[in-house]
Amino acid sequence: SAHAHPRDSCPLGPGRCCHLETVQATLEDLGWSDWVLSPRQLQLSMCVGECPHLYRSANTHAQIKARLHGLQPDKVPAPCCVPSSYTPVVLMHRTDSGVSLQTYDDLVARGCHCA
Amino acid sequence: SAHAHPRDSCPLGPGRCCHLETVQATLEDLGWSDWVLSPRQLQLSMCVGECPHLYRSANTHAQIKARLHGLQPDKVPAPCCVPSSYTPVVLMHRTDSGVSLQTYDDLVARGCHCA
């Protein structure tokens, strides 16, 4: 098969490889304080960490990328850690007529992989 | 809206920002020479280049990531250039009973964005 087995144990040591991490941010940090009313403090899950060879490969393309990066590191970048899925988040925001709740589907990461 | 307008002009100069680039690779490069018969030389489109602030943001999460990277560069990584879509590729490969053609949907990038 085109898929080599993606690796799930981090060879770089605990917390160094691609994983989900919570970052706290205020509406001011995001530049949203003029239109979002709540939450005023957001728990933002983000994907951080390195992507060593075949670690959490997103797909065949990522595996190829990892291999070619090993052969041509100046030409082909290593895979990088990005969201594989998202968790919907509800924001309360101003509208012309008052206040409204809206769900954002692509705001907070739920899982990560190397792409 | 949660979406700031993603930027499409590269502030770093031509060819420096996230874009699609063709990389030539042999079956030997990929470690596939024992099972893939054709093509023996692959034209692999890959996503390369940097992701400056708001350049080709994949979604709201990527815009947030870009903003927080500006505020906390040691804690939040910059968005990185990854495939937004793929082009199907047909490979001819060995099987127990002979030779077969199979389409791979996630092998070659078709478009790129910053995630």
């Epitope: 919570t22 706290q24 304080s33 003029d34 009313l37 709540s38 939450p39 005023r40 403090q41 957001l42 728990q43 899950s45 968790t87 919907p88 988040v89 509800v90 309360m92 206040v99 769900t103 907070v108 739920r110 | -």
Partner: antibody
Framework: QVQLVQSGAEVKKPGSSVKVSCKAS????????ISWVRQAPGQGLEWMGG????????SYAQKFQGRVTITADESTSTAYMELSSLRSEDTAVYYC????????????WGRGTLVTVSS | DIVMTQSPLSLPVTPGEPASISCRSS???????????LDWYLQKPGQSPQLLIY???NRASGVPDRFSGSGSGTDFTLKISRVEAEDVGVYYC?????????FGGGTKVEIK
């Protein structure tokens, strides 16, 4: 229709612990925070603390700090409130409520779990 | 902690008549965005509390328009324009400007 379904009534001895569960059914659990509010017999409402299920980050009222632990299991869409070193004054109905962070807007409440502390 | 004080403690009402409940906070609940982080809840007999008003003056989904919230800073009012029999219960204000969230002591509304 989204509901918060709480575990059943408990009778506990002083000094022991109790763990109350709150399961969200029919909605996106991680999109909101879950707070825990208690009400002693004939008394008013008291906020104990809450959690952001998406990150597992909890916040507690100083009064309960060290005695209460709030957790969440995203896989089962369930939040938990554990209260230790129980005393008779902890006899109350414990409610879970869904809100937008700690900015209020508790638009959905569980039916409550009566915890009785008695020797 | 922010102290929330409600008055009156008890409010006997006549159906069809208006009613008003006051809530005072020990600190301002007005945030820099111009909104007051104050909710009103109603707890009907034998039930869980239900959200009536959020951000000081916004009616929650499904709440009849006879309920209205007003006020700013430290002084807030919940008004019922024409009380109905189903409005009986205990009304609570709650501040959400800062943790810990705190509730008023409650106002018991009962039919005369």
């Amino acid at each position: 229709q989204v509901q918060l379904v709480q575990s059943g009534a408990e009778v506990k001895k002083p000094g022991s612990s109790v763990k109350v569960s709150c399961k969200a059914s029919g909605g996106t659990f991680s999109s909101y925070y879950i707070s825990w509010v208690r009400q002693a017999p004939g008394q008013g409402l008291e906020w104990m603390g809450g959690i952001a299920p998406i990150s597992g980050t909890a916040s507690y009222a100083q009064k309960f700090q060290g005695r209460v632990t709030i957790t969440a299991d995203e896989s089962t869409s369930t939040a938990y409130m554990e209260l230790s070193s129980l005393r008779s004054e902890d006899t109350a109905v414990y409610y879970c409520a869904r809100g937008l962070a700690y900015d209020g807007y508790f638009d959905l409440w569980g039916r409550g779990t009566l915890v009785t502390v008695s020797s | 902690d922010i102290v929330m004080t409600q008055s009156p403690l008890s409010l006997p009402v006549t159906p069809g008549e208006p009613a008003s409940i006051s809530c005072r906070s020990s600190q301002s609940l007005l945030y820099s965005n111009g909104y007051n982080y104050l909710d009103w809840y109603l707890q009907k007999p034998g039930q869980s509390p239900q959200l009536l008003i959020y951000l000081g003056s916004n009616r929650a989904s499904g709440v009849p328009d006879r309920f209205s919230g007003s006020g700013s800073g430290t002084d807030f009012t919940l008004k019922i324009s024409r009380v109905e029999a189903e409005d009986v219960g205990v009304y609570y204000c709650m501040q959400a400007i800062g943790v810990p969230l705190t509730f008023g002591g409650g106002t018991k509304v009962e039919i005369k």
